[in-house]
């Protein structure tokens, strides 16, 4: 079954900067990837977020760059400016379209104990939905 | 056939504010954000910002952020660029496009909007 | 912001000439480099994105190739439809930047 790995980090530099990273393990090719913040995107979530492999990469404020590491992995860097947007309690989530699979989904956010610069864990994938 | 109708050619004196509208036909309208992009007489091309017609969100380039508000109006399929605070630096053609998820290639452009700022 | 530097600034050629046009980005944007050509008098046209793939209907005699942040645009027998100028475009993120553009001439 393919799976959706999320991992949110504080930079040690720039304590209020912080990357989300995301992946996709499963066969097929990735066709589309979304991150949305405060929920899954579609239901509550605010898109910070799209990646094409082809047609381009596009974020929206406080995301500050989006970019692909692998083929089936994105980075996607925030910078937290302040009091109204504390990323630390907030959920991120990426969904990967693939094909032939469909969406596959899965939400994380930082440990609570987490020192800067340290990166979570992948996470346990709380949510995970197949579209 | 995807279509996008620009307002006609301004003449506008300096210090005032100028509305150009771009409406769109041919597609579904939700499905394209719409772009902004300003072209100085024999000059580059510069991004504006662009408006999401699902809920209007905007998305400005530093550069315009004070200087235009985009706007659409759903229930007409228009999109709509105000320019406010006119100087002679604002003459340019001012074209509408509409750009397909992720919404950073220009799909469909208007024919363009002549806005001279004179007195 | 990125920027996006072209050049020539402008380019006499003849028809049934081949042309190249070059265009660099002031960082890595992988493959995310579109052109755009404009005739006279008229709007932008989308003609290639991701380096290299060519939209709809443009003809197999433009070619684009380069990646990270150097970029080219390649014109093989030039047809009188292909004079104009030729912009190109980052597609990595926002602000979208545009090169200043090159102006491709009848000699």
């Known amino acids: 079954t393919p799976e959706v790995w999320v991992q949110v980090q504080m930079e040690a530099t720039e304590l209020s900067s912080f990357t989300v990273h995301c992946g996709f393990l499963g066969p097929g090719s990735i066709s589309l990837v979304t991150v949305s913040w405060g929920g899954p995107d579609g239901a509550g979530g605010t898109k910070l977020a799209v990646l094409h492999p082809e047609l381009g990469t596009r974020q929206w404020a406080p995301a500050r760059q989006a970019r692909w590491e692998t083929q089936s992995s994105i980075s996607l860097a925030l910078e937290d400016s302040g009091a109204s947007s504390p990323f630390a309690n907030t959920t991120f989530c990426c969904k990967f379209a693939s094909f032939p699979e469909g969406s596959w989904e899965s939400c994380g956010s930082l440990p609570p104990s987490s020192d800067p610069g340290l990166s979570a864990p992948p996470t346990p994938v709380p949510i995970l939905r197949a579209d | 056939e995807v279509q996008l109708q620009q307002s006609g050619p301004e003449l506008v004196k300096p210090g005032a504010s100028v509305k150009i509208s771009c409406k769109a036909s041919g597609y579904t309208f939700t499905d394209y954000y719409m772009s902004w992009v300003k072209q100085s007489h024999g000059k580059s091309l510069e991004w504006i910002g662009d408006v999401n017609p699902n809920n209007g969100d905007t998305s400005y380039n530093q550069k315009f952020k004070g200087k235009a508000t985009l706007t659409v109006d759903k229930s007409s399929s228009t999109a709509y660029m105000e320019l406010r605070s006119l100087t002679s630096e604002d003459s340019a053609v001012y074209y509408c496009a509409a750009s397909g998820l992720p919404y950073v290639l220009m799909d469909y452009w208007g024919q363009g909007t002549s806005v001279t700022v004179s007195s | 912001d990125i920027q996006m530097t072209q050049s020539p600034a402008s380019l006499s050629a003849s028809v049934g000439e081949t042309v190249t046009i070059t265009c660099r980005a002031s960082e890595n944007i992988n493959s995310y480099l579109a052109w755009y050509q404009q005739k006279q008098g008229k709007s932008p046209q989308l003609l290639v994105y991701?380096?290299?793939t060519l939209t709809e209907d443009v003809p197999s005699r433009f070619s684009g190739s380069g990646s990270g942040t150097q970029f080219s645009l390649k014109i093989n027998s030039l047809q009188p439809e292909d004079f104009g100028s030729y912009y190109c475009?980052?597609?990595?993120?926002?602000?979208?930047?545009f090169g200043g553009g090159t102006k491709l001439e009848l000699k």
């Open positions: 475009q980052h597609h990595y993120g926002t602000p979208l930047t």
């Open positions: 991701n380096t290299k």
